[in-house]
């Protein structure tokens, strides 16, 4: 997995008027890291993990950068023509990556009302856009605006690639992020599904990195994908992740089913707890 820094900026307009506030979220290696969500931006580390990475310092630099980016995006939204009545959003997602071989990738993506309409490879300066006519119109609109200020295009957008990588390297220097491994806590629960059946759920939490194998096995053989229901692998707010997998089995056969977990080269199996059903309602739909 490459190391990555991801900026997600969102600005809003109401009835054609661009709002003064904006939302910025920064993810480091896929984890929520910094956030600005007020009228006046104040960079806030997301949890102890982010504070550890940033160290004992104020986040003035981050605040200044994120505020500047927010202003730029508001100006861009103001130049999008044909805004209909009501609420609209412009989102800019910027990602840079450092791979294990030290190669880098940087890209920038624009979304209007949640729909992608323009992307740029920040290394090659190559622009791409979806085929839809709406996306093409929006893309031309925004590109023309960016071209109007040639200085801005050359400096600001060119610098984004270098700045992003510079910040990422700075955060990685903390050593907190660097190739850390946190093993998951795994627990298995059971709930009544229907007469004669129970739903067994296996939850893994508090693990890092996010790659994990979690599946149900019967007598040591994996159940097929379509007999299992998986939850997404989601950040749990502590710089780690959580996920789950569930399946439905016959009551009385619990001892034959195990939850298999593999994470960062380590693996374990977890039996279904015996005894009374613990939870009466099943989340299995």
């Amino acid at each position: 997995e490459p190391h990555s820094l991801r900026y997600n900026l969102t600005v809003l307009s109401w009835d054609g008027s661009v709002q003064s506030g904006f939302l910025t979220e920064v993810h480091l290696d896929g984890q929520p890291f910094l956030r600005c969500d007020r009228q006046k931006c104040r960079a806030k580390p997301q949890g102890q993990w982010a504070e550890d990475v940033l160290g004992n310092k104020t986040w003035d630099r981050e605040t200044r950068d994120l505020t500047g980016n927010g202003k730029d995006l508001r100006m861009t939204l103001a130049h999008i023509k044909d805004q209909k009545e009501g609420l609209h959003s412009l989102q800019e997602i910027r990602v840079c990556e450092i791979h294990e071989d030290n190669s880098t990738r940087s890209s920038q993506h624009f979304y209007y009302d949640g729909e992608l309409f323009l992307s740029q490879n920040l290394e090659t300066k190559e622009w791409t856009m979806p085929q839809s006519s709406r996306a093409q119109t929006l893309a031309m609109n925004v590109r023309n605006f960016l071209k109007e200020d040639a200085m801005k295009t050359k400096t600001h957008y060119h610098a984004m690639h270098a700045d992003c990588l510079q910040e990422l390297r700075r955060y990685l220097k903390s050593g907190v992020v660097l190739r850390r491994t946190v093993p998951p806590m795994v627990n298995v629960t059971r709930s009544e599904a229907s007469e004669g059946n129970i739903t067994v759920t296996c939850r893994a939490s508090g693990f890092y990195p996010w790659n994990i194998t979690l599946s149900w096995r019967q007598d040591g053989v994996s159940l097929s994908h379509d007999t299992q229901q998986w939850g997404d692998v989601l950040p749990d707010g502590n710089g780690t992740y959580q996920t789950w997998v569930a399946t439905r089995i016959c009551q009385g056969e619990e001892q034959r089913f195990t939850c298999y977990m593999e994470h960062s080269g380590n693996h374990s199996t977890h039996p279904v707890p015996s005894g009374k059903v613990l939870v009466l309602q099943s989340h299995w739909q």
Partner: antibody, heavy 122, light 106 residues
Framework: QVQLVESGGGLVQSGGSLRLSCVAS????????MNWVRQAPGKGLEWISY????????YYADSVKGRFTISRDNAKKSLYLQMNSLRDEDTAVYYC???????????????WGQGTMVTVSS | ETTLTQSPFSLSASVGDRVTITCRAS??????LNWYQQKPGKAPKLLIY???SLQSGVPSRFSGGGSGTDFTLTISSLQPEDFATYYC????????FGGGTKVDIK
Amino acid sequence: QVQLVESGGGLVQSGGSLRLSCVASGFTLSRYSMNWVRQAPGKGLEWISYINSRSNTIYYADSVKGRFTISRDNAKKSLYLQMNSLRDEDTAVYYCARVSDITGNTGAFDIWGQGTMVTVSS
Amino acid sequence: ETTLTQSPFSLSASVGDRVTITCRASQSIHNYLNWYQQKPGKAPKLLIYAASSLQSGVPSRFSGGGSGTDFTLTISSLQPEDFATYYCQQSYNALTFGGGTKVDIK
């Protein structure tokens, strides 16, 4: 006693079909996952198909995928293997085998039938 | 698909010998490995499951070891009834057998 008995083998033309059966006795078939394994003359064992107790997980070896179908009828205590588009290389002794239900099992086959011979001729 | 490679292909040994057969997996299969014995004209018989657990009724001279990609089946003191072909089998990633190792009389 616990046993599995295969039947349905025989001589068949290349491109033809055959249906193998495996009848269980001495245990409740519905509780167990089952397999078909074959062994060509003078060769090693080749796993070809798996079906779990609820018939909701089925696997095939690449060599038979799309041609063979595993199924079971728990009420009849029977496991089946429908073999279509048979080829010369399908000639083998076909065994049905039960997956052990012992705690901590890793997909081991604890009970095997005596096998039934299938010969495909061109 | 996980492939299992057994070695040696065959071996000659005498009664009382200590015999070791190896099975190597193309990827880590943790302990999802089983061992079988097969005699000519007979169905295979389960000896070891989960890499090292002895199946009920199997003599204690048989033992299994290893995890990940490298596994062994050891017969501590070969008996006349042990001359047979031995197979490993995995269930970590679908199901596959190794090619077999024939143990015959020296």
